[in-house]
């Protein structure tokens, strides 16, 4: 069993290394920024990410592309719930520095938990998405 788990971990690691989780990150950021824009947040505030949604994109244009590609990537983990959880954790960790304030972080986490379901996939049970302070990119 231990040997199998070791192989499973290794397989998951290589799957994660080949996965492109950026579309998921963009899709989620679009979602929470669209929500915030409707509450009066300045949609033209600058971003460090060259592919962060423009104000034009945030109104919904282009977002289906990020979602479609994101779902394709998550679909690769469908047979391995633990690995799916690790992918979600990686998304959370990669974006944690870009999330402004506790409220945005909670909103991002909520959307992230719903992501597999949104893609028509099984959501991993008991997947801890808490990020230790100073989370950094694993890319």
């Amino acid at each position: 069993r231990q040997q199998w788990e070791l192989q499973g971990d290794r397989r998951c690691q290589s799957q994660l290394e080949r996965a492109n989780l950026r579309p998921c990150e963009q899709h989620l950021m679009q979602k929470i920024q669209r929500d915030e824009d409707s509450y009066g947040r300045d949609p033209y505030s600058p971003s460090q990410d060259p592919y962060s949604p423009s104000p034009y994109d945030r109104r919904g244009a282009g977002s289906s592309q990020h979602q479609e590609r994101c779902c394709n990537e998550l679909n690769e983990f469908e047979n391995n719930q633990r690995c799916m959880c690790e992918a979600l954790q990686q998304i959370m960790e990669n974006q944690s520095d870009r999330l402004q304030g506790r409220q945005q972080e909670q909103q991002f986490k909520r959307e992230l938990r719903n992501l597999p379901q949104q893609c028509g996939l099984r959501a991993p049970q008991r997947c801890d998405l808490e990020v230790e302070s100073g989370g950094r990119d694993r890319y």
Partner: antibody, heavy 123, light 108 residues
């Protein structure tokens, strides 16, 4: 050397079938999404089909849906395109292309292409 | 499906001149999913730009890409003899992953 080599093209009658293959070498085949793209004589590029790393997501152009089937064998580093109910309009050079992405920013692109195999559908 | 329309169909210019190629989408395309390819007669396509504005490995800096939403542009600042070819834009965000019909860049 990273390489893709297509084979299986030829002359076939309308309504006939053909199976194209693409042999990959010089890279870890199972790490990449793969695509088929075709080009009719004197025309532009037309995307035909794509398949993800573990074959879990497959897409087709509307023009070939229900007639063509893409598949891959990661153990043999090969990509296939089964073409049934062929039409005159399917006459083209068929390219196999590897899809990669920019690790830091995320965009996808087809960075490695084969030289193509020619399919002629004619009575 | 997203339809990409390239213009002009043919562009006749001389070496040293500036070339501006346009790619217009029927609906918004995220920059992340806009790619440009170059193809010479009898050859397979070659990756030129991805993410709308990032040059692929080995592509000289006279090539640049810009645009967002539905309007994208490929610019070649000073044409070299080897740049005369057909150029295609492609979107790969929504299936089917469509190509534009191409712009032929020919020597005047």
């Amino acid at each position: 050397e990273v390489q893709l080599v297509e084979s299986g093209g030829g002359l076939v009658k309308p309504g006939g079938s053909l199976r194209l293959s693409c042999a990959a070498s010089g890279f870890i085949f199972s790490d990449y999404n793969m695509n088929w793209v075709r080009q009719a004589p004197g025309k532009g590029l037309e995307w035909v089909s794509s398949i993800t790393r573990s074959s879990r997501t497959i897409y087709y152009a509307d023009s070939v849906k229900g007639r063509f089937t893409i598949s891959r064998d990661n153990a043999k580093n090969s990509l296939h395109l089964q073409m049934n109910s062929l039409r005159d309009a399917d006459t083209a050079v068929y390219y196999c292309a590897r899809e990669d992405f920019d690790v830091s920013t995320g965009p996808y692109y087809m960075d490695v292409w084969g030289n193509g195999t020619t399919v002629i559908v004619s009575s | 499906e997203i339809v990409l329309t390239q213009s002009p169909g043919t562009l006749s210019l001389s070496p040293g001149e500036r070339a501006t190629l346009s790619c217009r989408a029927s609906q918004s395309v995220s920059n992340m999913f806009l790619v440009w390819y170059q193809q010479k007669p009898g050859q397979a396509p070659r990756l030129l730009m991805y993410g709308a504005s990032t040059r692929a490995t080995g592509i000289p800096d006279r090539f640049s890409g810009s645009g967002s939403g539905t309007d994208f542009t490929l610019t070649i600042s000073r044409l070299e003899p080897e740049d005369f070819a057909v150029y295609y834009c492609q979107q790969n965000g929504n299936s089917p992953y469509t190509f534009g019909q191409g712009t032929k860049l020919e020597i005047k």
